[in-house]
Interface confidence: medium
């Protein structure tokens, strides 16, 4: 399988929500000795590798945000965690990853990365990322929603496999 | 046949470091983190910390932050990790171990430990 | 960080009873994703610790039947339905749920 972000660029208000999103294409393994670990964090367009450093979302690291389950299953997070922190990341059957931020602040922008790590314990493993930067913006100039830029098609596949 | 093949006993001196190495074989290594434990008088466990042996990514106990350093080597499939300012305190018997689902916190697999005993 | 507490430290049994040891943790364990990151290990004398249970209820592979797990929120209970000698030695609760991961404090199961 494959991991493709829809979109590349997310331009937001201060304010509002965004949901960004990932998709997975391609089969995912089913299976009992099959895991699929989902999550998100916040990164920096590193010199050796994009989404090689994870930083937190609002306080939130990868591992608090992390989704579980095999095959493709739907999943989220709590909505205890949306509420206390403004953010839910969910998946649902058809391959579709996101996370939602309420109410957006300068604070927000950055690089955004997904990931996907296929397991099947231990005889093999497959992981993917993709990337996609939220730029929020406050005055004038800001648009009066969140304005999406799509990915070429270059760089919506960004494919990782040990 | 799945192993964690570590390093053997250390003895060393109040404010040195020490490094010791856990060989990983039988599996995918970049598959799952590899958790570092230590055990004090073959009691109570401590976790240390984790690496992502694919990213080299980290994650500590703040505890142990400053004192533990956490690094593998893809190549050799083996991770390490480093004692530095060695005190009476560090003696203990360290363990690497596999996560069972890449990073969820459960660990399949234990190194036979490695033993570290700090005295002048 | 999240506080294990396991009771009783230490299990006198006789072979062929039934062992039942108990975990508490300072905090619920459920995690945001609505799993629960609530293991058990068995360390016995002179070895590494080796995983009988995770996430609460499943018996890691090889591990007999008559081990089991249950509980949710703060309290789990760890059960061993027939004692057999194998079976001695040290267990230990974990969590996974919160970083830093932590551990209770054991329970040495042993011969009456």
């Known amino acids: 399988f494959k991991v493709t972000t829809p979109y590349s660029l997310y331009v937001c208000p201060e304010g509002q929500n965004a949901t960004l999103t990932c998709r997975i294409l391609g089969p995912v393994s089913k299976g009992h000795d099959v895991t699929i670990y989902k999550t998100w964090y916040l990164s920096s367009r590193g010199e050796v590798q994009m989404c090689s450093e994870r930083r937190p979302i609002r306080n939130l690291t990868f591992q608090d945000l992390h989704l579980h389950h095999g095959g493709h299953q739907a999943a989220n997070t709590s909505h205890d965690l949306a509420q206390r922190h403004g953010l839910e990341s969910a998946s649902d059957h058809h391959g579709n990853f996101s996370i939602t931020m309420r109410n957006l602040t300068l604070l927000d922008s950055g690089l955004y990365c997904c990931l996907v790590v296929e397991i099947r314990h231990h005889h093999s493993e497959h992981r993917v990322h993709g990337a996609m930067e939220l730029q929020v913006q406050t005055g004038k100039d800001a648009p009066s929603n969140c304005v999406v830029y799509p990915s070429s098609s270059q760089d919506s596949e960004n494919i990782t496999a040990a | 046949e799945v192993q964690l093949q570590q390093s053997g006993p250390e003895l060393e001196k109040p404010g040195a470091s020490v490094k010791i190495s856990c060989k990983a074989s039988?599996?995918?290594?970049?598959?799952?983190?590899m958790n570092w434990v230590k055990q004090n008088n073959g009691k109570s466990l401590e976790w240390i910390g984790n690496i992502d042996p694919y990213y080299g990514y980290t994650t500590y106990n703040q505890k142990f932050k400053g004192k533990a350093t956490l690094t593998v080597d893809k190549s050799s499939s083996t991770a390490y990790m480093q004692l530095k300012s060695l005190t009476s305190e560090d003696s203990a018997v360290y363990y690497c171990?596999?996560?069972?689902?890449?990073?969820?916190?459960?660990?399949?697999?234990w190194g036979a430990g490695t033993t570290v005993t700090v005295s002048s | 960080d999240v506080v294990m507490t396991q009771t009783p430290l230490s299990l006198p049994v006789s072979l062929g009873d039934q062992a039942s040891i108990s975990c508490r943790s300072s905090q619920s364990l459920v995690h945001s994703n609505g799993n629960t990151y609530l293991h058990w290990y068995l360390q016995k004398p002179g070895q590494s610790p080796k995983l009988l249970i995770y996430?609460?209820?499943n018996r890691f592979s090889g591990v007999p039947d008559r081990f089991s797990g249950s509980g949710s929120g703060t309290d789990f209970t760890l059960k061993i339905s027939r004692v057999e000698a194998e079976d001695l030695g040290v267990y230990f609760c974990s969590q996974s749920t919160h970083v830093p991961y932590t551990f209770g404090g054991g329970t040495k199961l042993e011969i009456k």
């Open positions: 171990a596999r996560d069972y689902d890449y990073a969820l916190g459960y660990f399949d697999v």
């Open positions: 039988g599996y995918s290594f970049t598959g799952s983190n």
């Open positions: 996430k609460v209820s």
